[in-house]
């Protein structure tokens, strides 16, 4: 038995920040779970983790180079990524594991979300003519 995950196919980070919502076919209320966000087609880099426990405050971990926060809904975890760089444009996959109560559950691999980080284009300074000659 696997949890299904829904993600937006694509998100654009215009201001170097994005909210990625991972929606699950499972209610996380009063569960012990570990939700994570993985970067790359092979999910090689785990960039953000949210650990939830019925008795503790939500714990969020960000890998060095990523600035991440997490918010819990009944059937979702939203990852808020800030200070993204253009070279962090990639496909990101949500993963979920539920440890307690038994049985252990994890998810079918989702389709992922392409996060396109748009560079900040600075407008050139206006050119002022030099002092006019008499």
């Amino acid at each position: 038995n696997k949890i299904l995950v829904k993600q937006s196919p694509m998100l654009v980070a215009y201001d170097n920040a994005v909210n990625l919502s991972c929606k699950y076919s499972y209610n996380l209320f009063s569960r012990e779970f570990r939700a994570s966000l993985h970067k790359g087609l092979d999910s090689a880099v785990e960039v953000c983790v949210v650990y939830g426990n019925y008795s503790q405050q939500l714990q969020v971990y960000s890998k060095t180079g990523f600035n991440c926060d997490g918010k819990l809904g009944n059937e979702s975890v939203t990852f808020y990524l800030q200070n993204l760089y253009v070279n962090q444009t990639d496909i990101y996959f949500c993963k979920i594991e539920v440890m307690y109560p038994p049985p252990y559950l994890d998810n079918e691999k989702s389709n992922g979300t392409i996060i396109h980080v748009k560079g900040k284009h600075l407008c050139p300074s206006p050119l002022f003519p030099g002092p006019s000659k008499p």
Partner: nanobody
């Protein structure tokens, strides 16, 4: 809840070796990390080395690179710290830590659970 039990500390001469072990028990996810930190008298607890369980990823403090090796036994949920070429400045209480982060984190605040510590003394 995760429990950590360390062993392997002791007294050794400069240039000697020791191997520390840390066994974790409790509910484990498919990816997590364990690390070693140390605290010398009157000093802050500092990062030594860490390794994660989902993928082969290890990190070391500059002061121990080339002398210490961190490894793991997934089947036993145990992490080891092989320490060689020990120096007087390596004398400290060594603590094992556990984090739900899936990478070899050097950040003390990332670690949720700690062992009781094991004393390593390096003296002639």
């Amino acid at each position: 809840e995760v429990q950590l039990v360390e062993s392997g500390g002791g007294e050794v001469q400069p240039g000697g070796s020791l191997r520390l072990s840390c066994a974790a028990s409790g509910r484990m996810f498919s990816n997590y990390a364990m690390g070693w930190f140390r605290q010398a008298p009157g000093k802050e607890r500092e990062f030594v080395a860490a390794i994660n369980y989902g993928r082969d990823d290890a990190d070391y403090a500059e002061s121990v690179k080339g002398r210490f090796t961190i490894s793991r036994d997934n089947a036993k949920n145990t992490v080891y710290l092989q320490m060689s070429s020990l120096r007087a400045e390596d004398t400290a209480v060594y603590y094992c830590g556990f984090t739900y982060a899936g990478w070899a984190s050097s950040r003390r605040d990332d670690y949720n659970y700690w062992g009781q510590g094991t004393l390593v003394t390096v003296k002639p």
